[in-house]
């Protein structure tokens, strides 16, 4: 028969024959040939292979740098990396996740529109009218004016972005 | 700081067993593979086995299969090596390992280890 | 298994020698650590990963190789080198250690 010049999914084609890819978490020690099957051997400690294979040697499972803002999140096994994410209050400068950076803070007269997580930063908006932040958090969200009316006060002083409006008493018209 | 406390010596009898443990502190066993080595008087180091504290799943080389069982207590951060049949040949120090994946390199951190001695 | 013979098993060195010590695979691995033990206390990492070194070690320290040869060398041995040395494979299961190599200041 004609040797083949392609093979199936999970096989490879080595001296004109299909020999069986090594699966995730394994390395390959040697091809198979004609009367032999493919051989392969777990990927050792601190190593890993994702994917079917014919690699010889296992890739490192990756370091979470504590110097770098980071920590472990799942460690490695023989067939996944080791997942890192940021330390409490920073989050990832990259979808790789190879160091961190602190979640950005948003300034008076911008409240937090979304909380950071260990992979986004914090979104900030803009407070609308009704609406202020008086102080720079990555947390406190704009809050609404206080609403003179339902204390049966009267609005003083407008508010802003950044201030709360200050509410008085009402003027007592004479007599 | 990353500790590892071991548990005290132990003198015991043949045909007995002993369980010896490992509490961890500064990180958590999850993040680590548990190995245990053996080191008998006089004599160089040999890798008893190491267990995954996730899943529990363990290897072990082949000659103490069946003379070691490796367990782990997540809740107390503990790892625990029993070794039953006890001979005079598993008179040794006892090493808990961890391969810790917040470490920058494997096998950083040792402890003092356990000594054990089989003796009537 | 994979068997780790290291040679020579006992050295000594006088201060200011180089050393190399050699720890040889019956097959081949991905990469090798070097551990350093004195007497009473238990071992520790020195070499990481065939040629790393651990933090506080000091650079006369070096670790190469690849396959089924490798090598720890002091460029200038120190009193306090002195100390069993044990290579070992992380590669295969199960990981194995070579018996070690005893280094002793002459």
């Known amino acids: 028969p004609e040797p083949p010049t392609a093979c199936r999914e999970k096989q490879y084609l080595i001296n004109s024959q299909c020999c069986s890819l090594c699966q995730p978490g394994q390395k390959l020690v040697s091809d198979c040939t004609e009367f032999t099957e493919t051989e392969c051997l777990p990927c050792g400690e601190s190593e890993f292979l994702d994917t079917w294979n014919r690699e010889t040697h296992c890739h490192q499972h990756k370091y979470c740098d504590p110097n770098l803002g980071l920590r472990v999140q799942q460690k490695g096994t023989s067939e996944t990396d080791t997942i890192c994410t940021c330390e409490e209050g920073w989050h990832c400068t990259s979808e790789a996740c190879e160091s961190c950076v602190l979640h950005r803070s948003c300034s008076p007269g911008f409240g937090v529109k979304q909380i950071a997580t260990g992979v986004s930063d914090t979104i900030c908006e803009p407070c609308p009218v009704g609406f202020f932040s008086n102080v720079s958090s990555a947390f406190e969200k704009c809050h609404p004016w206080t609403s003179c009316e339902t204390k049966d006060l009267v609005v003083q002083q407008a508010g802003t972005n950044k201030t709360d409006v200050v509410c008085g008493p009402q003027d007592r018209l004479r007599a | 700081e990353v500790m590892l406390v071991e548990s005290g010596a132990e003198l015991v009898r043949p045909g007995a067993s002993v369980k010896l443990s490992c509490t961890a502190s500064g990180f958590k066993i999850k993040d680590s593979y548990i190995h245990w080595m053996i080191q008998r008087p006089e004599q160089g180091l040999e890798w008893i086995g190491r267990?995954?504290?996730?899943?529990?799943?363990?290897n072990f080389d082949p000659k103490f299969r069946g003379k070691a069982t490796l367990t782990t207590d997540t809740s107390s951060n503990t790892a625990y090596l029993q070794l039953s049949s006890l001979t005079s040949e598993d008179t040794a120090v006892y090493y808990c390992?961890?391969?810790?994946?917040?470490?920058?390199?494997?096998?950083?951190?040792w402890g003092q280890g356990t000594t054990v001695t089989v003796s009537s | 298994q994979i068997v780790l013979t290291q040679s020579p098993a006992i050295m000594s060195a006088s201060p200011g020698e180089k050393v190399t010590m050699t720890c040889s695979g019956s097959?081949?691995?991905?990469?090798m650590h070097w551990f350093q033990q004195k007497p009473g206390n238990s071992p520790k990492i020195w070499i990481y990963?065939?040629?790393n070194l651990a933090s506080g070690v000091p650079a006369r320290f070096s670790g190469s190789g690849s396959g089924t040869s490798y090598s720890l060398t002091i460029s200038r041995m120190e009193a306090g080198d002195a100390a069993t040395y044990y290579c070992?494979?992380?590669?295969?299961?199960?990981?194995?250690f070579g018996a070690g190599t005893k280094l002793e200041l002459k």
């Open positions: 990963f065939t040629s």
């Open positions: 070992q494979q992380g590669s295969t299961y199960p990981l194995t």
């Open positions: 097959s081949s691995v991905s990469y």
């Open positions: 390992v961890p391969n810790y994946y917040g470490s920058r390199y494997p096998f950083s951190y």
């Open positions: 267990i995954d504290p996730t899943n529990g799943n363990t």
